[in-house]
Interface confidence: low
């Protein structure tokens, strides 16, 4: 009689994570008597997946009634497949004895697991940067299989080309991780901009995953200052305004100096927002010129978002105004919206 053969008809099987995998195995003879066992891997480190004779294998069920005496189909189904289940599975016939001895093995079925990548996480630089500077964004996604994956970067819908991507590990693994770094040049209009990392994988069925980062968390747009003298509001009073334009983020502190001496400090609160997301703010100072014998140097000094202060000065001519002897400087400083 022809010697028993163990037939595993499928060289490979591919299953999505969470599904069940059916691994086929038939034998060509009922002789010799003895159980079938399934293993993952070969050699001394192989892992027992199912033993027909004994043991508890909660995720494994037999496809046919393997307990029947004449049964020759020893196919199994493994439920709730995860990437950790990937590998080559062998159906092995044992000869009954004390102990049972291995008689013949099938050729093996390679189980590959299709696992979806995790949602891409995009992170930007730790510190803010100003327009014209280049900043780096990273994108990470994990846990996918097979290894083939496509990653693209976009800024406001425009695809970026300056990026570098690695998929790890380089060798065989049950699942993989992708890491990409893109370089983005900031512009003054980027407060409302978004950087998008898009990951496409066979498991996503054409619907890529996206991770985003808002450039509002990365950009700092420094303000421009303009100090102007307004017409006299009342006798001996001059209104000087400091217009702070096009800044982001809102965190800003303004100090008025008269001839180098601090007159008043205030924090930008009620600001107006421009269409590009930057802010404008205006502060004014009422100067009592009768309190000054000489010309006054007024300085508007602005500290924006913790950066070194910038300032703009204005020389106020007081010679044309009458002077009251002995009077003190009276200055009023108020913030207001610039409409």
């Amino acid at each position: 009689e022809e010697e028993l053969q163990v037939i595993q008809p499928d060289k490979s099987v591919s299953v999505a994570a969470g599904e069940s995998a059916i691994l086929h195995c038939t034998v060509t003879s009922l002789i010799p008597v003895g159980p079938i066992q399934w293993f993952r891997g070969a050699g001394p480190a192989r892992e027992l997946i199912y033993n027909q004779k004994e043991g508890h294998f909660p995720r494994v069920t037999t496809v046919s009634e393997s307990t029947k005496r004449e049964n020759m189909d020893f196919s199994i189904s493994i439920s709730n497949i995860t990437p950790a289940d990937a590998g080559t599975y062998y159906c092995v016939k044992f000869r009954k004895g004390s102990p049972d001895t291995e008689f013949k093995s099938g050729a093996g079925t390679e189980l590959s697991v299709r696992a979806k990548p995790s949602a891409p996480v995009v992170s930007g630089p730790a510190a803010r940067a100003t327009p014209q500077h280049t900043v780096s964004f990273t994108c990470e996604s994990h846990g996918f299989s097979p290894r083939d994956i496509t990653l693209k970067w976009f800024k406001n819908g425009n695809e970026l080309s300056d990026f570098q991507t690695n998929v790890d590990p380089v060798g065989e693994s049950v699942s993989y991780s992708i890491h990409s770094t893109a370089k983005v040049v900031l512009t003054r209009e980027d407060v409302h901009s978004q950087v998008i990392c898009e990951v496409a994988h066979v498991t996503l069925q054409g619907d890529p995953l996206r991770g985003t980062a808002n450039l509002s968390e990365t950009i700092r747009v420094p303000p421009t200052l303009e100090v102007t003298q307004q017409p006299v509001r009342a006798e001996n009073q001059v209104n000087v305004t400091c217009q702070v334009r096009k800044f982001y983020p809102q965190r800003l502190q303004l100090t008025w100096l008269e001839n180098g001496n601090v007159s008043r400090t205030e924090t930008a609160s009620t600001v107006t927002e421009n269409k590009d997301g930057t802010y404008n703010w205006m502060s004014w100072l009422l100067v009592n010129v009768s309190a000054h014998r000489d010309d006054v140097k007024l300085t508007c000094q602005v500290e924006h978002d913790g950066q070194p202060a910038v300032s703009k000065s204005h020389d106020l001519k007081v010679s044309a105004h009458p002077k009251e002897q002995g009077s003190n400087t009276a200055a009023e400083n108020t913030g207001s919206n610039e409409r």
Partner: antibody
């Protein structure tokens, strides 16, 4: 055979410096992120520092930041840890370990046998 | 930094029995968690990564589960060589941090 061998440990006074080395063999060194992990006598494991496969990215534990510097020479298959301003609490066995990829994902699956650093006056 | 807390500090189990070790993160680390085994006088050995994936050459009796902040390492039937120290480590946020360890001893 994959191997990593640390060296450079020894006895040093507080405030002193040491440079640890880890020579790797049996694998493509530049393809793997590397790390230093330490273990004080009778204590648990403490992650110290990590460096990406290319060397472009480094990270440190708060306890060593500003004092220790991790670096690598991929042409020599060697990882380094420059330790300055050493303190008594830096006394430990220092292990070098390799991550499973060029970035720091998965675990550290290859370890050296460790080198002992003792900081004492 | 993320604080990893392991419990119990010491676990006494008889050979052949099941051992369950716990690890809790002070904030979510997703599934970015590894388990290591360390025998006295030896370097650590990676057992599990990705919370549940066995590393190369690790026997099937070791299994990991959990995600977010709660994780478990289970050794289904303890062998004599399994009595050692076990550490969890998160690699979701820098700095990467280990738990303080669980010592598994023979009952």
């Amino acid at each position: 055979e994959v191997q990593m061998l640390e060296s450079g440990g020894g006895l040093v006074q507080p405030g002193g410096s040491l440079r640890l080395s880890c020579a790797a063999s049996g694998f493509t060194f530049s393809s793997y992120a590397m790390s230093w992990v330490r273990q004080a006598p009778g204590k648990g494991l403490e992650w110290v520092s990590a460096i990406s496969g290319s060397g472009s990215s480094t990270h440190y534990a708060d306890s060593v930041k500003g004092r220790f510097t991790i670096s690598r020479d991929n042409s020599k298959n060697t990882l380094y840890l420059q330790m300055n301003s050493l303190r008594a609490e830096d006394t430990a066995v220092y292990y070098c370990a390799a991550y499973s990829g060029s970035y720091y994902y998965y675990g550290m699956d290859v370890w050296g046998q460790g080198t002992t650093v003792t900081v004492s006056s | 930094e993320i604080v990893m807390t392991q419990s119990p500090a010491t676990l006494s189990v008889s050979p052949g029995e099941r051992a369950t070790l716990s690890c809790r993160a002070s904030q979510s680390v997703s599934r970015n968690l590894a388990w290591y085994q360390q025998k006295s006088g030896q370097a650590p050995r990676l057992l599990i990564y990705g919370a549940s994936t066995r590393a190369t050459g690790i026997p099937a009796r070791f299994s990991g589960s959990g995600s977010g902040t709660e994780f478990t390492l289970t050794i289904s039937s303890l062998q004599s060589e399994d009595f050692a120290g076990y550490y969890c480590q998160q690699y979701n946020n820098w700095p990467y941090t280990f738990g303080q360890g669980t010592k598994l001893e023979i009952k």
